[in-house]
Structure formats: C-alpha cells, structure tokens
Interface confidence: low
C-alpha cells in the first residue's frame, strides 16, 4: 500500500533541519528520506 513519504525540500528553522513532510507536518531532526522525482535518495 502507498504509505506516507517525505517530499524533497527542506529549510533551516531554529538552526535545525525541517523537512517538507507534506500532510503530516515537519520533523526537526534526522534525515528520514528525500524524494526526488519519486525516487528515495536518502
């Protein structure tokens, strides 16, 4: 089934990485996964 994924893109907020985890908010911490062109690259 198609579960949630993290979209590509991030920004620095309070000197912490904020991922563009669309729909479920953001995670300030570690890299969970980057999507580029539909492919997980990290």
């Amino acid at each position: 089934d198609a579960e949630f994924r993290h979209d590509s893109g991030y920004e620095v907020h309070h000197q912490k990485l904020v991922f563009f985890a669309e729909d479920v908010g953001s995670n300030k911490g570690a890299i969970i996964g980057l999507m580029v062109g539909g492919v997980v690259i990290a």
Epitope: A2, F4, H6, E22, D23, G25, K28, I32
Partner: antibody, heavy 125, light 106 residues
Framework: EVQLLESGGGLVQPGGSLRLSCAAS???????TMWWVRQAPGKGLEWVS?????????NYADSVKGRFTISRDNSKNTLYLQMNSLRAEDTAVYYC??????????????????WGQGTLVTVSS | SYELTQPPSVSVSPGQTASITCSGR??????VAWYQQKPGQSPVLVIY???KRPSGIPERFSASNSGHTATLTISGTQAMDEADYYC?????????FGGGTKLTVL
C-alpha cells in the same frame, strides 16, 4: 462552527467488523490531513491511522495494520475507518481529529486542533 | 519504536506553578504538542510547535523543548486546570503520544 462528529461505534464480537464515520462541518477534509486516535478505557491516547490531503497517502499503527482501512468521501465530507478482525484489545473510544495546517506554510507540524466527541467500540463475546 | 515518558501524576496547590515533563530520545529534534483532556471530554490542543499557544488558551500555559525533555508549565494553576495532559511528538511520519500525566490541583 468547525466540528467533527463520529458515529458507528457499538458492541461487536471478536473477529467482527465495524465502520466508523466522522462527519466534518465548516471545513473540507479533503484539504486537511485527518487522523484516527483511540483511547482504551482508563488508558492514554494511541494514534491509529492517518490520511493525507492526497488520499493515496496513508499510514497505520502496527497494531492495526492489515485489519483497519482509512478512507474518505469528499462529496460527503466524511472520514471513515473500516475495522475488520476486531480483537478485545481494540476496545476503546475512537476519535477523529484534524491536523492543524497553516496553509500559507503547509509543511509545519501544528498538532491536532479539532477533535470529535468520540465513539465507543466494545469488542466482547 | 519511539517512546515518550511522562510522570503518571503531578500535584499542585492553587496559584502555584505546575511542571509536567515529557522525556524521549532527542525529543528536542522534533516538534512537540501538548493536549489537555478533562474526564469524559475530548482532548484539547494547548501547545503546538514546542511552545506556541493556540488562540483561546490562557497565557498561564507555556512550554519548552530541548535535548531529551519537553516541559509543559502552568503558572498560577487554577482548579479548572485539573485534567490529564498528554505530550505528542512526531516519529518519522506517525504520531507518538506520551502515557499522560494526571494533574491534581489540591
């Protein structure tokens, strides 16, 4: 007034099925991430399932994966939770909740700002 | 799986300050929200994004989050603040709730 109203709970035997509904008022569920959260009697809150604005995006807690299915009907502005193969440990009050999104900055976690009144599911023989 | 730990109960006298902790591995790296739940009622969001108050939540509610501990502080606690309080954080793309803390106003 922005609100959520759950229905569909009740008494069911182990192995049985139920479908919970959550009707939204004054906002469009299709534009929000929606959650199901449950609370067993006398216990804490437990995340159950989530569906995103893109309804192909969803996720389930390990405890319900393969048994529960989240969905929504945008025309009825209603969220659903289909629960199959129910177990005694699924007995709980089930809440639907809206993820608060600032649509000008839609990638931030704000928490669940609107909750329904809850519907009780009792699994017992 | 990620776990958030809260004290089961906290007691405070009216007018005093109550602090409720929420511990988790590197919780400071994730956003935290706090919910208040009174008996027979649905949860209410009282803090979001670590330390922000939604409109309608009294100023006596404040919070912080760094390292391995998030803290909810209620200054000048009132009888109406007696409730269960739950912290919540993000574990990848799911939500995790703490076990809850029962705040008793003596």
């Amino acid at each position: 007034e922005v609100q959520l109203l759950e229905s569909g709970g009740g008494l069911v035997q182990p192995g049985g099925s139920l479908r919970l509904s959550c009707a939204a008022s004054s906002f469009q569920i299709s534009k929000n991430t929606m959650w199901w959260v449950r609370q067993a009697p006398g216990k804490g809150l437990e995340w159950v399932s989530v569906i995103g604005k893109d309804e192909t995006r969803f996720n389930y807690a390990d405890s319900v994966k393969g048994r529960f299915t989240i969905s929504r009907d945008n025309s009825k502005n209603t969220l659903y939770l289909q629960m199959n193969s129910l177990r005694a440990e699924d007995t709980a009050v089930y809440y639907c909740a809206r993820e608060w999104m600032d649509h000008s900055r839609p990638y931030y976690y704000y928490g669940m700002d609107v909750w329904g009144q809850g519907t009780l599911v009792t699994v017992s023989s | 799986s990620y776990e958030l730990t809260q004290p089961p109960s906290v007691s405070v006298s009216p007018g005093q300050t109550a602090s409720i902790t929420c511990s988790g591995r590197n919780i400071g790296d994730s956003w935290v929200a706090w919910y208040q739940q009174k008996p027979g009622q649905s949860p209410v969001l009282v803090i979001y994004r670590d330390d922000k108050r939604p409109s309608g939540i009294p100023e006596r509610f404040s919070a912080s989050n760094s390292g391995h501990t998030a803290t909810l502080t209620i200054s000048g606690t009132q009888a109406m603040d007696e409730a269960d309080y739950y912290c919540s954080s993000q574990d990848t793309v799911t939500r995790v709730f703490g076990g809850g803390t029962k705040l008793t106003v003596l």
